[in-house]
């Protein structure tokens, strides 16, 4: 969370950004809020990126002005125009690329004053893991798969019954490059598992951490997955 103050004569406004992460190949959002101003025509939003000449995006007088937009962002940016008057200057970024990572500035000018704040935008790939019972192995096994990760993550197994146990000797993890030659599919198999025990497959890189849980009983297979972005908010 970054809060910036701007001064215009005696007037300044608070601008707030949140460090966030983009999933390459998907759409992302760079979050920025400011003190609302009901006079839409008096609001100017400028997004800038460190090291890039020209603007990422500009919104003024109630509409986009892309005359100074840098070519790497052409056709890929939008603000939430209907939410600008309530103080939302967040930027929608289509088809996130690895090269979109960096330091961005959200600059705001309204009839109340002006202000800006920076945000760090990380890019990579992250996806929810799915754990299933694996029937290819000779012993009772679990297979944890996640389709898209970058950079290469670490994978670890844990179990509710054997807390603190090291499962590296009874698991096998592989990383398979996807067709776009950047992201990788993660596959990890855990051997010699038992019923009535909750097993967790944890996948983590410097952008995100994902966990898949599974519990096999006589009567059902319970699964749960969750994904959290790291160093955000």
């Amino acid at each position: 969370l970054i809060i910036g103050f701007g001064i215009s004569g005696k007037h300044f406004i608070t601008v707030t950004t949140f460090t966030s992460a983009g999933n390459i190949g998907e759409d992302g959002t760079l979050s920025c809020t400011f003190e609302p101003d009901i006079k839409l025509n008096g609001i100017v939003i400028q997004w800038l990126k460190e090291g890039i000449k020209g603007l990422v995006h500009e919104f003024k007088e109630g509409k986009d002005d892309l005359s100074q937009q840098h070519e790497m962002f052409r056709g890929r940016t939008a603000v939430f125009a209907d939410q600008v008057v309530v103080g939302n200057a967040s930027l929608r970024l289509k088809n996130v690329q690895l090269t979109d990572a960096g330091t961005y500035t959200c600059y705001i000018r309204t009839s109340k004053g002006k202000g800006n704040a920076n945000l760090e935008y990380k890019t990579g790939a992250f996806s929810m893991p799915e754990i299933n019972v694996d029937y290819n192995a000779s012993s009772e096994s679990l297979r944890c798969e996640a389709p898209r990760w970058f950079p290469q993550p670490t994978v670890a197994w844990a179990s509710q019954v054997d807390q603190g146990a090291n499962f590296s000797e009874v698991s096998n993890t592989s990383f398979e490059l996807n067709s776009e030659n950047v992201t990788m599919k993660v596959v990890s198999v855990l051997y010699n598992v038992t019923i009535n025990n909750t097993y967790s497959c944890m996948i983590e890189n410097d952008i995100a951490k994902a966990t898949g849980d599974i519990k096999v009983t006589d009567s059902e297979v319970k699964r749960r997955s969750q994904l959290q972005l790291l160093n955000s908010g």
């Epitope: 029937y135 019923i195 096999v216 006589d218 009567s219």
Partner: nanobody
Framework: EVQLVESGGGLVQPGGSLRLSCAAS????????MHWVRQVPGKGREWVSR????????SYEDSVKGRFTISRDNAKNTVYLQMHGLRAEDTAVYYC???????????????WGQGTLVTVSS
């Protein structure tokens, strides 16, 4: 209450055929893998075969491969074991059981019927 009722056993000559049936009730049949297990009198139980809920996956113990075929009719909540080329060593009480997955450790199975006796003898 889970109920499994096996039928179709009997006396058959070596090389003969039998079709076992297992009628299931008391649970959602289509949520479960179904397994056949056999027990030679005086010995421990041995897993024979399994079938997935949608019949897309089947598996067999090595000694019955190519001779036994497992199938199921989800509309009738029934699982079958078609046995051909029967041998004397196939003589056993045959049980069907259910499990949430295709794992087949005998100690995992909690629900058993009364079984049906298959005797292979000339």
């Amino acid at each position: 209450e889970v109920q499994l009722v096996e039928s179709g056993g009997g006396l058959v000559q070596p090389g003969g055929s039998l079709r076992l049936s297992c009628a299931a009730s008391g649970f959602t049949f289509t949520d479960f893998w179904m397994h056949w297990v056999r027990q030679v009198p005086g010995k421990g139980r041995e897993w024979v075969s399994r079938i997935s809920p949608d019949s897309s996956s089947t598996s067999y113990e090595d000694s019955v491969k190519g001779r036994f075929t497992i199938s199921r009719d989800n509309a009738k909540n029934t699982v079958y074991l078609q046995m051909h080329g029967l041998r004397a060593e196939d003589t056993a009480v045959y049980y069907c059981t259910r499990f949430s997955t295709g794992w087949h450790r005998i100690e995992y199975f909690q629900h058993w019927g009364q079984g049906t006796l298959v005797t292979v003898s000339s």
